[in-house]
């Protein structure tokens, strides 16, 4: 055993605002003193296996798992997590020890599990095992349900690893499209974990607890439906289970279904078939394709074929991390006072997002609707024609997204005036932003047509509450206009509004609205 290298396993906790944490699994700067994880040789294991002390991490914490190897010569390595191999770049420190690091940013439930590090040195090969779990803070969680096949039975079990224990229900629907909305009479709910009736058109499983309700739909290709223009797409994260159901109905039993991934038949343990006769004596067959824990190489086109139906495919994409894809550039809109208008954001995301619309520090519920092309859309129509800044915010386990909108309402200016001993000011929030004129009313100009250009100062300011622009114009008082009536007028393409002010000595000022 003297050939075995000296190995040290450490855990580095990063402060969450730590800019040094890299996005790769290379070697970020150490932000806190490393914690020794022991790394003892595991007895009775085939091969040389070192086991680090179990690591418990807070949700959203960022950590680095690090191995220091005191062995001569070069080393090569490979990380494996949930059957997926991850990049590994060893380097050497000042003491010439090999250093291998794995960075976990913003810890989530999906990143918990066993991390295996395989190291090959010139002398020997060995494995290091890290077990990472989320610290049991008494936080409630609600996890999206997933499916498992019931042992030795043609049935699906629905599982949601949530705290407190959720109520699990199957939501079944046998008609098409809109009539499968949640409260439709076509929808049947079964409050149980196991489902044997797997022939329905639309099958979802939902889990609910104090935090709300999360659902997962059984992804289905129906060969009796006309092939769609856009290929259905299914996203999954490494380690999640894959389930696709292929369904076909034919006048008799003389047809079979097959699954292929990139033109290769699925392996024996990755599919199972069920068939039944429907009420009108037609034969329904379903063929499930499943992978209990997906890896990157499960990505590809899954094609379901039948001798009696056109083949159809779905693109399955396995990602390391969830995402939200949408354009985050801010958008400005101007509408008329009674024009119907909705903000909308089109996005592609996995896992499904939680979202809110915010206006003037008030949040509004956010609904999302799936489109045929794999995108989803969220619309907000409840703006009540209030101008200002509207914010769409979305997040899932791994990503966040914010988009800003500005709504301007086209309207004639409304003028408010105020005055002090030295100046008079007028304000307007019409849109487009108004231009200003000041006029003096005198014996020579009883209709107030004598324009004042001296001492006028115009500006636009952002009224913070709603994020809407207010235009103002200030007239500095001079001896020439003291004691006179002056008129400030705001005008834009929709009209003009004026206010008349008597510039007398300090004291209350009468204002005469003049539209």
């Amino acid at each position: 055993n003297q050939d075995l290298p000296v190995i040290k396993c450490v855990l580095i906790n990063h402060k969450n605002n730590d800019s040094s944490v890299g996005k790769s699994s290379s070697y970020p700067m150490v932000s806190e003193s490393p914690e020794d994880l022991g790394c003892a040789l595991r007895p009775q294991s085939s091969g040389t296996v070192y086991e680090a002390a179990a690591v418990e991490v807070d949700v959203s914490a960022s950590i680095t798992l690090q191995v220091l190897v005191d062995a001569p010569g070069n080393i090569s390595c490979l990380w494996v997590f949930k059957h997926s191999s991850l990049n590994c770049q060893p380097h050497f420190d000042l003491q010439n020890r090999g250093v291998v690091s794995m960075v976990i940013l913003k810890m989530t439930e999906t990143q918990a599990g066993e991390y295996l590090l395989f190291i090959q040195s010139e002398a020997t090969n060995y494995t290091i095992l890290f077990t990472v779990s989320i610290r049991n803070t008494l936080l409630y969680t609600l996890r999206r349900p997933y499916f498992r096949k019931m042992e030795n039975q043609d049935a699906l079990v629905c599982i949601s690893e949530s705290v407190p224990e959720p109520i699990v229900e199957w939501v079944l629907c046998d008609s098409q499209g809109e009539s499968c909305k949640e409260e439709s009479p076509a929808v049947v709910k079964k409050e149980e974990k196991v489902l044997h009736e797997l022939f329905g058109t639309d099958i979802r499983c939902c889990a609910r607890n104090e935090l709300g309700r999360e659902c997962t739909r059984l992804f289905t290709i129906d060969l009796n439906q006309t092939p769609q223009t856009t290929l259905p797409q299914l996203f999954l994260k490494v380690g999640e289970p894959l389930w696709i159901r292929c369904k076909a109905v034919h006048v008799n039993h003389g047809f079979g279904l097959t699954w292929e991934l990139e033109n290769k038949a699925l392996e024996e343990g990755n599919y199972f078939e069920m068939s039944t006769y429907s009420t009108n004596r037609t034969m329904i067959r379903i063929l499930f394709a499943f992978v209990s824990s997906v890896a990157r190489n499960d990505t590809g086109y899954y094609t379901c074929s039948s001798s009696k139906h056109p083949s159809q495919s779905a693109l399955v994409t396995i990602v390391e991390k969830g995402f939200i894809n949408a354009t985050n550039s801010s958008e400005d809109y101007e509408i008329d006072q009674y024009e119907e208008f909705c903000f909308s954001v089109r996005f592609k995301a996995y896992p499904q997002i939680r979202c809110t619309w915010t206006f003037s520090r008030k949040s509004f519920p956010c609904e999302q609707k799936g489109l045929d092309n794999g995108y989803s859309i969220s619309k907000f129509c409840n703006h009540k024609h209030q101008p200002g800044e509207y914010i769409f915010h979305a997040e899932n386990d791994d990503a966040q997204f914010t988009k800003m909108f500005t709504l301007n309402i086209r309207r004639k200016p409304q003028v408010l005036a105020e005055a002090s001993a030295s100046q008079a000011s007028c304000f307007s929030d019409g849109y487009p932003l108004p231009s200003w004129t000041w006029k003096k009313c005198s014996d020579k100009s009883p209709n107030c047509t004598e324009e004042i250009t001296e001492g006028v100062w115009n500006r636009k300011a952002n009224r913070k509450v709603f994020g809407q622009w207010v235009s103002s114009s200030t007239l500095n008082m001079s001896e020439a206009i003291k004691g006179f009536l002056v008129k400030c007028c705001a005008y834009n393409s929709l009209g003009t509004s004026c206010e008349t002010i008597l510039l007398n000595s300090p004291g209350p000022f009468p204002f005469i609205q003049d539209n």
Epitope: L231, E260, E262, N263, Y301, T303, S305, S307, S311, L315
Partner: nanobody, 111 residues
């Protein structure tokens, strides 16, 4: 990446015939089946026909009995034979493999 190129479109009188071709290049070994679609002006793209690797063919109800799809594996080409053409068959015709589409070929049927 599979590339697809349609050809054979043109102007034809009602009742006439046309044969469209769809030539595939790139990793054609990965082609399990090829679909034909069409898009008439101002309408959604609709599925027309499919031919599988085993030369099984399937058709939309609107073209059944008039259109026939075939393939020549040696030339990596699929054909859509269109007979008894009607003005409502006027459209741009596309072939598709999985997520890959051709540029389309225009078919105009005059009455």
């Amino acid at each position: 990446q599979v590339q697809l190129q349609e050809s054979g479109g043109g102007l034809v009188q009602a009742g006439g015939s046309l044969r469209l071709s769809c030539e595939a290049s790139g990793p054609t070994f990965s082609i399990n089946y090829i679909d034909w679609y069409r898009q008439a002006p101002g309408k959604q793209r609709e599925w027309v026909a499919q031919i599988t690797r085993d030369s099984n063919s399937f058709y939309a109800d609107s073209v059944k009995g008039r259109f026939a799809v075939s393939r020549d594996n040696a030339k990596n080409t699929v054909y859509l034979q269109m007979n008894s053409l009607k003005p409502e068959d006027t459209a741009v015709y596309y072939c598709r493999v999985l997520s890959y589409w051709g540029q389309g070929t225009q078919v105009t049927v005059s009455s």
